[in-house]
Structures are given as C-alpha cells and as structure tokens.
C-alpha cells in the first residue's frame, strides 16, 4: 500500500523535511503533490511527468519544494505555515489513480528564556516569590532547575500557568539559590541564565564569644557578637542595661571586679526591621593564690600503702587539674579522683609512682600550677644479683664478688660463706684462694625502712681441674629454614677458653654460624636438616681441658614433594595396582590418598586388586608434617587398558 513517511515528523523552522514515498506502484505516468488531505487543483504544489522527467510547479508552489523521480518531496526553509497534511496523487499508465497522505509538524527554534520575579527581596517566613519564565511560547514545555538540579519535592513549591510560573511560599534562607528555567519543544531546548534569590532573614539570636564568663582582675575583656542575618546585622552593646557602643566587638582593657555584670548584645536588621538580643553574665575575680600539694603519706611502702594528694587551697566553684610527669592523668584503676577533682589517690603505690605531681586551679582563661611534688616510695630489696657470674675459679687467684639489690632506701648487705656471717659490706674480697674456699656464698640485702630482707646463693668451686662442661639449648626442636638455635657451653668459668666441634670436627666456616659471649655461645641461623649433627663443646685453661657429651640437634623439616613408585602410568586390566608414596620429613609425615579428588585411605601404600579401565584417573598422594605445620602433594595419572591393548608397559601384582 502506498504510504508517506515524514522525515523528520517534528521539523524546526528554517530546516528541511522530506516526505518519503514507500511502496510506489510500477508503470507510472506521473504524480502530483497537494497541500492538505485531498486532491485540490488550487492547492497543487508540484507535478512530475516521468516520461519527460519534467517538474511543473502548481498554484501552492512556494519555490522551496523539490520533487524527486521516486515521488518524494523535499521542502526546505520550513515555515510555521507548512504544518499539516500533504497528499500524493499517483497516476498510473492505465490512468488509474492512487493517493496517500502524510503529515508533519513545524515548531519554532526556541529563543533563550529569561526569568522575571515579582519580589526581588523577599523576607523569610513572610513573603512568597513568583518566578515566571519568559517569553510565553505556544507548544513549549517549561522546566525549572534549582542549583542545576530538578525541583525538590516541597509543599512550599508550586508550579502553575502550565509550569511557566514557579511560586515559593513562605521563603526561607535556604531558598537562597540559583534558579533557572528551561523551555523545550520537540525540536529545541533552551535554558535561561541563573537568577539568584536574595532572601532577607534574621537576625537570629546572637552568639557572644568567647563562651567563658569568668575573668581575673587585670585581664582584657574582648567580646564578639554574631547573628545570622541578611543583610548583615547592626550591633549594639549594653552593660547592666546601659548602652555602650554600636560595634560588633566590645573591648574593655584591664578589667576589675567592678566590671562584673550582665553584658547584652543587640542585633538589628534594617531591612526586616527585627531585633534580637543575647545576655551573658561576666564575673571578674581577684587574683587567686598559687596552689600547692599536701600528702597524707610522705614515705609510702610499695604494694602496701595508698597515698592521697590534695590540691590546696579549697576554693568554691573552681576546677582542679592534675598532671603526672608533665602529662595529664593516665587512665588507671590505681588512680582515683575525688568528686571535685581536688584529691588524687594512688592505690597500692609502686616505685614507678614517684612523679613529679602537679595540680592546677583553672580560672577560665588560664591555669595556675603548683610546684611539683615527688613521692618517696619505699621498695625492695629485690632479689640481689652477685657478679661476676663465674662459678669456677683456679687456685691462687683473687675472689672479688659484688652484690646489688634494687631498694629504697639503699639496701644494707651481708655476706655468708656456708651459712657463716663474714662481713657487712656490698663487696666480698678474698685473695689467693685455694680449694678450701669452695662453698656456698650467700648475699643478704636488707631494707631498714620496710624491714624486708632478700638473699641470693652462689656456688663457688675452686679447682685446678675444669669440670666436664654441658650444652644447653634455647630450642630443642627447631624448624628448617625458619628457626635459629643458640647452644651455650656451661658453666661460665674465669680465664677459660671455649671450643666447639661438629661431628668431631672443628667448626666449618659459614655465614649461618656465629660465636658470641667469649665463644661460649654458638648460634645457628636458619637451621637446615644438614645441621642435625653431634655438637660438642670444650673448655680449657692453662692447667686442664674437658669436653661435653655430644648433643644431637633434632631439626624438624619437610615434608618434601613426595615420590610415588613404581613410576609406571599404564596398566593392563586385571593387574594389581600397588602404589607407594614417600616424602622426606622429620618427624615422619602422615600420608593420605585421593583418586580423582575423592579421599581414600590414610596409608603410605595404596593397593587396588584387579584394576579395570574404571580405575583410570588422577592419583594424588598428600603428606603433612604436624610438627612443622607444612603440607605437600603430588599427582600421578594412571591409565588402565583392556587386556592386550596397553599402549605402554603393564605392571603386575
């Protein structure tokens, strides 16, 4: 069927439209276009005779129309009056006629709109504002944008007049925004410049800063007032009801107690005609005294006594502050503050609670600090230590032992040999010792203030012969490539040389081996399974030498990547499958099998009798070492062929 398609359907003024003909019959004599929905000679636009390829204009021709050989009609430089229907009249060679009608609509290219307003300075919570989008255009859609976003949903926003007018009821300061309108029709869209709504508001209740109301005599009083307002507010100050000045700030230098009173800030908005006031009460104090700290216990005993520190003097309506070691109080269950913060209690004092302690009195703008106080905490004595640490001496040398125990006041020391008091000194000196000087040497430390005593006993051996040494280790089961091991040769002896052997040979040169502590300690870094050897230490002096029993290092390692044997992967149907898995590991690993991902048995050997092609698949051996926490696995593919068709070797039972 003959049809007309308009391209485009909606046309902008000044542009072109093509009335495209579809399903044009064959064997045509010619055709003619008419304005309107019917054939009317007075409204003929143009005709076309196919034989002569000649176009002929009609009464409705405007000079803007062009007809094509395929009967399509182009109209250029479109005007508003072109809107409507167009009829194509087709004359066939047999002089039978056919008609089709098409249509299009013409729209103007829209001008840039602008916004008019009925109120340029609306007052908050009082006025309404109506914005109108100009000009009024037929067949145009109107849209509104606030801060480049579509209109928010609000009961105070109302669109009217075909959306051409936007009304804001009861404007607020938050309506101060950029407003734009947009006009749209099917062929164009234009947006206006933005209009900023200037809402008059305020003043709100003013705020006076700073907030503090207490001052010391001699300070400067500097108050500032601010109230949200458009246009900005005008400010006035009143002291005890008497007008002072019309400024935003009030400054009074070198105030006295007489400046105490009520200070009022008044904010005024000349456009809204509104006034708001805020009152603050200022109190001026005379200079307070410097605080000081008193204590209920000047010599508390560690872990026994509590101490209460009090900040003096007591002043009503005053904030008390505390500092320990020049820092604010740490959070601790042993520190307690009284309700007024004036007393700080230390429960069960320790030697670390010595301080210094400071308290302060806060006076609004500043803080007065006390002098620091240091606590004399009595503690100790702790277990004394005897030095040097040697236990073996050769005859003929001098024995010089020193004793020390942490204590306050400092400890008093006594020495005993085999339980017999020797002397009341910190050091014990015996010259030219012999075997008879061997025995138990006791140091006793006493704190006279706390009455506590502590002792330490040391065995001293005087002998020309060195004792048989022994090896101590800091790690009896190190993990390979992870741990280090430190061997120490015992005992510690004076003027003694320490030696080491590994598997009966002197130490190899290795960056992983390190001697320290006068060669008394041998450290193996990043141990490996090859370090699992016999270690012997020896001690020697100018008189004698001795060796320890060997110590064998038990290095935990693995599991390494397992090996499945036999290596064959092809089997004949009916054979027995006997796979064995092995992985180097210390201690021995746990084994488990999976066939095609399905767990089997937890054994080292996997046995399947009389296999068939159903036993084809992947055979995985999993190993795990519980001591090292490490795992490993290997996968092997097994192919079972029907008897006589095996591509490879067969493995029997």
């Amino acid at each position: 069927k003959l049809t007309i398609e308009s391209t485009p359907f909606n046309v902008a003024e000044g542009k072109e439209v093509l009335l495209l003909v579809h399903n044009l019959p064959q064997h045509l004599f010619g055709y003619s276009w008419y304005k309107g929905e019917r054939v009317d000679g007075n409204r003929q636009i143009i005709g076309y005779v196919i034989g002569t390829q000649q176009a002929t204009p009609g009464p409705a021709y405007s000079g803007r129309e062009i007809i094509y050989p395929n009967a399509s009609l182009l109209i250029q430089n479109i005007i508003q009056n072109d809107t409507g229907f167009y009829t194509l009249h087709v004359i066939k060679s047999d002089l039978v006629n056919e008609e089709a009608t098409g249509q299009f609509r013409v729209y103007p290219e829209l001008p840039k709109p602008s916004i008019s307003s009925n109120n340029s300075k609306p007052v908050e919570d009082k006025d309404a504002v109506a914005f109108t989008c100009e000009p009024e255009t037929q067949d145009a859609t109107y849209l509104w944008w606030v801060n480049n976003q579509s209109l928010p949903v609000s009961p105070r926003l109302q669109l009217s007049n075909g959306n051409r007018t936007l009304t804001l009821f009861n404007v607020t300061r938050n309506d101060t925004a950029s407003y734009k309108c947009e006009t749209q029709n099917p062929v164009s869209a234009r947006r206006s410049d933005s209009v900023i709504l200037n809402v008059l508001y305020g003043p709100d209740a003013p705020t006076i800063s700073p907030l503090n109301t207490s001052y010391r005599s001699g300070e400067n009083l500097n108050l500032s007032c601010h109230a949200a307002s458009n246009p900005p507010a005008q400010y006035s100050w009143f002291v005890n009801g008497t007008f002072q000045q019309s400024t935003q700030e009030l400054f009074i230098p070198n105030i006295t107690v007489n400046n105490s009173g009520s200070y009022t800030c008044q904010a005024h908005n000349s456009d809204t005609g509104l006034n708001r006031t805020t009152v603050t009460t200022i109190t001026v104090y005379a200079e307070p005294p410097k605080p000081f700290i008193t204590s209920n216990n000047s010599n508390p005993v560690e872990d026994e006594d509590a101490v209460a520190l009090t900040c003096e003097p007591e002043i009503q309506n005053t904030t008390y502050l505390w500092w320990v070691n020049n820092q604010s109080l740490p959070v601790s269950p042993r520190l307690q503050l009284s309700n007024d913060n004036r007393t700080l209690t230390l429960l069960s004092v320790t030697r670390n609670d010595v301080g210094p302690y400071e308290c302060g009195i806060q006076n609004e703008l500043s803080v007065d600090h006390s002098d620091p106080v240091i606590l004399n905490v009595l503690y100790g004595p702790d277990d004394p230590t005897i030095s040097p640490s040697y236990t073996y001496y050769r005859p003929g040398v001098n024995l010089s032992l020193s004793c020390h125990a942490a204590s306050n006041p400092p400890a008093q020391y006594s020495w005993l040999i085999d339980g017999n008091i020797q002397q009341h000194t910190q050091e014990l000196f015996i010259s030219n010792i012999t075997e008879k000087n061997s025995g138990l040497y006791t140091c006793q430390a006493n704190n006279s203030a706390s009455g506590h005593s502590r002792t330490t006993v040391k065995t001293i051996t005087v002998s020309a012969e060195l004792p048989k040494p022994s090896i101590s280790s800091n790690n009896s089961k190190p993990v390979e490539d992870k741990d280090a091991v430190a061997f120490t040769c015992e005992p510690e002896a004076q003027n003694t040389t320490y030696l080491w052997w590994v598997n009966g040979q002197s130490l190899p040169v290795s960056p992983r081996l390190q001697l320290s502590n006068g060669n008394r300690t041998l450290t193996l870094f990043n141990v490996t399974r090859n370090d699992a050897r016999a270690y012997v230490c020896g001690i020697q002096n100018s008189v004698s030498a001795n060796r320890s029993d060997p110590v064998t290092l038990d290095v935990l390692y693995g599991p390494d990547t397992p090996i499945i044997s036999p290596p064959d992967s092809s089997y004949l149907s009916g054979a027995n499958l006997n796979l064995s898995c092995h992985s180097a590991s210390n201690p021995s690993p746990q084994y488990s099998w999976r066939i095609n991902g399905i767990p089997q048995q937890h054994t080292q050997v996997l046995f399947i009798a009389k296999i068939t092609p159903n036993n084809n698949g992947t055979y995985a051996c999993f190993v795990s070492n519980l001591a090292t926490g490490r795992n490993n696995s290997i996968v092997k593919s097994i192919t079972v062929s029907a008897s006589g068709t095996s591509p490879g070797l067969s493995a029997g039972a």
């Epitope: 143009i46 007809i67 094509y68 430089n77």
Partner: nanobody, 119 residues
C-alpha cells in the same frame, strides 16, 4: 503563476564573458535556493552553481570555480550567473532551477538560454 525565465545567452569568443539572468515569479527567491544547470549534447547534465539566499551560502562545480559567480537580487526576485573566461566546453543550454543544498538535487522548468563559445 509560478515561472522561471532565463535570459542573457548568446555567442561569445573563448575567453569572453556573459551574464545570465533568472527572473522568478509566483514565489520569493529569498526563501529558497536557486541553481544553474547546463545541458550539452552528448554530455551529462551538470549543476554549475547554486545560491541559498536564506542561508547566505553558495556552491560551484569544480569545472567553473574561479570563473563563474552566482548572485541574487531579492528586490528584483532575480538570480544571476556571471560567466568569465569562457571556454568551448562551456557551450550548453543553461537552465535556472530550484536547488536543494541538503540533498544536492534540483527541479527546473524554464525554457533555458543557449550559450555558445566559439571563435
């Protein structure tokens, strides 16, 4: 009545000049595009120049660029084709046409005017 009437043709020597006129009636040339089309025996029909007065644009065939100038006088509703440096190959019947700059097509129905370039 809608009409396009061409005039100004004639015999001219090579290198000479002619000015063709196209008088339109029944519509305003300021609303549309006017083109000059030439037909010569044994040659393909050729659009040589066109002017869209409402757009203020002109176009020329490569063969006449720099030699021919198209213009329009909207007060007289007439279009003109000034032809300079004429060559023998410019010999043809010149028709005034309604031209579509958009689809590069035209309709014409005037009688045409003959231009002969010969020594």
């Amino acid at each position: 009545e809608v009409q396009l009437v061409e005039s100004g043709g004639g015999l001219v020597q090579p290198g000479g000049s002619l000015r063709l006129s196209c008088a339109a009636s029944g519509f305003n040339i300021k609303d549309t595009c006017i083109g000059w089309v030439r037909r010569a025996p044994g040659k393909e029909e050729e659009l040589v120049a066109a002017i869209c007065t409402y757009k203020g644009t002109t176009r020329y065939a490569d063969s006449v660029k720099g030699r021919f100038t198209i213009s329009a006088d909207t007060s007289k509703n007439t279009a003109y084709l000034q032809m300079n440096s004429l060559r023998a190959e410019d010999t043809a019947v010149y028709y005034c046409a309604i031209y579509s700059h958009y689809y590069d097509y035209y309709n014409y129905w005037g009688q045409g005017t003959t231009v002969t370039v010969s020594s």
